[in-house]
């Protein structure tokens, strides 16, 4: 069995994690996908898509949202309003059985610390910060629009986007990530 190297990422409370990973659509388009947290050596399924998966239809479980794009082999995971207790090891997987899931990319070691969510989260060896202030319009907007979104791009092995409450973070792995919002 190939040992997957875990990727460590650090965020502030209140930020949002968005992971976009891809899969072999020929094999897994109709499979259920799941977002799981490792507790000890056992994974705990936090959310899973329906089967058959309807294109893009969001599945929401508490603060977690899954979106599956089976025609293109994409799965998007979002965890909003991160809390210190969310820290841990996570995996994006093809859900076959609670004890038998296919991991789509390296496990994510998520570290959430207290502090201002307006500051960038960090990833080891990050190389770039890009800021974007989400739009404000005449109508009332939710908390997503109250402070800048931050993007942190890591070296070629991974890419992280760090954001403020309600906006998104993209975590990319060499073969697995879909897109990284970058705003100038």
């Amino acid at each position: 069995t190939t040992e997957l190297t875990e990727e460590k990422y650090e965020y502030k409370e209140g930020q949002t994690l968005e992971v976009k990973c891809d899969y072999a659509l020929e094999k897994y388009a109709n499979s259920r996908k799941a977002w799981q947290k490792m507790e000890g050596k056992m994974p705990k399924i936090l959310a899973k898509t329906e089967r058959p998966s309807e294109n893009s239809h969001p599945v929401q479980v508490g603060r977690i949202t899954l979106e599956d794009y089976p025609d293109h082999g994409l799965l998007q995971v979002r965890m909003t309003n991160l809390q210190v207790e969310d820290s841990g090891l996570y995996q994006c997987v093809i859900y076959q059985h609670p004890k038998e899931s296919h991991v789509l990319f390296n496990p994510i070691c998520l570290v959430v610390t207290k502090g201002s969510s307006g500051t960038p989260g960090s990833s080891e060896n990050s190389t770039q910060n890009v800021y974007r202030t989400p739009s404000t319009t005449a109508k009332a907007l939710g908390p997503r629009y109250t402070s800048p979104r931050t993007v942190t791009q890591a070296p070629p092995e991974s890419t992280v986007v760090v954001s403020t409450p309600g906006s998104e973070i993209n975590l990319t792995n060499v073969t697995d990530i879909i897109r990284v919002p970058v705003f100038n």
């Epitope: 893009s56 239809h57 979106e67 070629p156 309600g166 879909i178 970058v182």
Partner: antibody, heavy 117, light 107 residues
């Protein structure tokens, strides 16, 4: 069959307003992020704005921030773009497009907006 | 924003020719690049996504390759209906940005 049909374009004076609509059919509209993309005459394509499935998030290209507002009515399978304080440089064909995670996979036929005095 | 530079801006070719269009990103975008075909007065049509995956219904004479910053769209044997303008789109960094287009004309 997926269909996106834009309407609402026309001739408007600088500083004026216009509201574009996009009627969607053939797919579960409420399950997708949607975007507006524009193309000035003889020019290339430019993403303008997008909106999340439930309307809770919206983003804009810098040049239209504070002037344009994207919205949607999932009950009516409709996408909208309210354009205020229009400028000559906003003259373009405006397309609504479905965001499929790594591309815009379906587009409408476009509606022409001309800003001129 | 990530800048996308297409080359050439136009190319003259004959039916049956092999045509190659390139797109270069101002920073690495991994494989998150799409290619579109647009004919005058028509909306763009998705040909390729994720750099090399062929969109359903698109003829196999179209192919894409590349990753990182350099990408290529190849039409293996040009057909009369392929004369059009082609655009690349990067979907790695938001806002998504397009290349300036490559017009494929009849020689």
């Amino acid at each position: 069959e997926v269909q996106l049909v834009e309407s609402g374009g026309g001739l408007v004076q600088p500083g004026g307003s216009l509201r574009l609509s996009c009627a969607a059919s053939g797919f579960t509209f409420s399950s997708y992020w949607m975007s507006w993309v524009r193309q000035a005459p003889g020019k290339g394509l430019e993403w303008v704005a997008n909106i999340k499935q439930d309307g809770s998030e919206e983003y804009y290209v810098d040049s239209v921030k504070g002037r344009f507002t994207i919205s949607r009515d999932n009950a009516k399978n409709s996408l909208f773009l309210q354009m205020n304080s229009l400028r000559a440089e906003d003259t373009a064909v405006y397309y609504c497009a479905r965001d499929y995670g790594d591309s815009f996979d379906y587009w409408g036929q476009g509606t022409l907006v001309t800003v001129s005095s | 924003d990530i800048q996308m530079t297409q080359s050439p801006s136009s190319v003259s070719a004959s039916v049956g020719d092999r045509v190659t269009i390139t797109c270069r990103a101002s920073q690495g975008i991994r494989k998150w690049l799409a290619w579109y075909q647009q004919k005058p007065g028509r909306a763009p049509k998705l040909l390729i996504y994720a750099a090399s995956r062929l969109q359903s219904g698109v003829p196999s004479r179209f192919s894409g390759s590349g990753s990182g910053t350099d990408f290529t769209l190849t039409i293996s044997s040009l057909r009369p209906e392929d004369f059009a303008t082609y655009y690349c789109l990067q979907a790695h960094g938001f806002p998504w940005t397009f290349g300036q287009g490559t017009k494929v004309e009849i020689k």
